[in-house]
């Protein structure tokens, strides 16, 4: 069964996918498609890499990670409800039936309705509601609800919690393997 990832309408979604290049000069082609991985290739391709670079992409889909080092995680900009569904990351390893296939389920939640802005609400700009880690567990994307009106003590506490949180750290390492 596919791992589930969540994002909110209007935010960027992050779908992790990694592999370890076998040889520095010759990367493994990767395709991303909308829909579960078929027997071959990717259906409804949204992005593709070849032995050196990104050679096909569609609007809003891009690789933000070190894709030449094997981080082929997909970023989808400014998601809408229509972006919900299964996505396929296919590592196209040479040879018959050698491909690594990963199905990832993206769940898009409606944007939260926020009350009329107050001066204290300016604080939320410093802490966007979607905090993304590029870790290796199943919960790479976590969503914070709308922040209520809070006092300065609460702001300080929340800031410290965010600073200390693992959400604030990039857990990805250069030796990541396919998962």
């Amino acid at each position: 069964s596919e791992v589930e990832y969540r994002a909110e309408v209007g935010q960027n979604a992050y779908l992790p996918c990694f592999y370890t290049p076998a040889a520095p000069g010759n990367l493994v082609p990767v395709c991303w498609g909308k829909g579960a991985c078929p027997v071959f290739e990717c259906g409804n391709v949204v992005l593709r890499t070849d032995e050196r670079d990104v050679n096909y992409w569609t609007s809003r889909y891009w690789l933000n990670g070190d894709f030449r080092k094997g981080d082929v995680s997909l970023t989808i900009e400014n998601v809408t409800l229509a972006d919900s569904g299964i996505y396929c990351c296919r590592i196209q390893i040479p040879g018959i039936m050698n491909d690594e296939k990963f199905n990832l389920k993206l769940v898009i939640k409606p944007a939260k309705v926020t009350p009329a802005p107050t001066r204290q609400r300016d604080f939320t700009a410093a802490f966007p509601r979607m905090l993304t880690t590029r870790g290796h567990g199943p919960a790479e994307t976590q969503t914070l609800g709308s922040l209520p009106d809070i006092n300065l003590t609460q702001i300080s506490t929340l800031a410290n919690e965010l600073r200390d949180s693992r959400l604030a750290n990039d857990l990805r390492d250069s030796g990541a393997t396919i998962r």
Partner: antibody, heavy 120, light 107 residues
Framework: QVQLQQSGPELVKPGDSVKMSCKAS????????MDWVKQSHGKSLEWIGY????????SYNQKFKGKATLTVDKSSSTAYMELHSLTSEDSAVYYC?????????????WGQGTTLTVSS | DIVMTQSPDSLAVSLGERVTINCKAS??????VAWYQQKPGQSPKLLIY???NRYTGVPDRFSGSGSGTDFTLTISSLQAEDVAVYYC?????????FGQGTKLEIK
Amino acid sequence: QVQLQQSGPELVKPGDSVKMSCKASGYTFTDYYMDWVKQSHGKSLEWIGYIYPNNGGTSYNQKFKGKATLTVDKSSSTAYMELHSLTSEDSAVYYCARGGYYSYYSYDYWGQGTTLTVSS
Amino acid sequence: DIVMTQSPDSLAVSLGERVTINCKASQSVGNNVAWYQQKPGQSPKLLIYYASNRYTGVPDRFSGSGSGTDFTLTISSLQAEDVAVYYCQQHYSSPYTFGQGTKLEIK
């Protein structure tokens, strides 16, 4: 140390072809891509294409398809670029540059450039 | 093709002053941007790769930052030998494209 030694200046007539070379030394030639870049006089840089000496694989800027042909001779660690059907627009300095995996395929070493003048 | 637009086209700065050169990509290129320095009559030299990594032997007054579409090359304290044209380049997707160049002079 790594060096890319390019062939000397060329003066050719319109319609002719020219083949310039880039001899690599100081590293394993087949482990790195070789890219070619054009710089017209007083202008910016234009990527022409690359070749991967390990397997001869190439990729070209659409603008230079049919204009440039990239080849390598692994035995002499030399990359070549042939330019066809030359016009005055092809007059420029042409650089070979090593595309390094460890620098994310930015160009860590460049040749000194070959100046091509197309004139009747 | 991805268009890389540098600003300014040229600038004159006093020795010891801070220099900032900007580069904007027409679409996101992740961190796949390099900066090169080209002095008159010379080949370009790599300064910064992968947006913020200083290449071997490059003085630490040079630094790069940015990701996505907006990138910056900074020289913290301008030296006389920094007079050159500076180019950004995206190597996210072919055709790899360069900015138009920024000419840096001493005021």
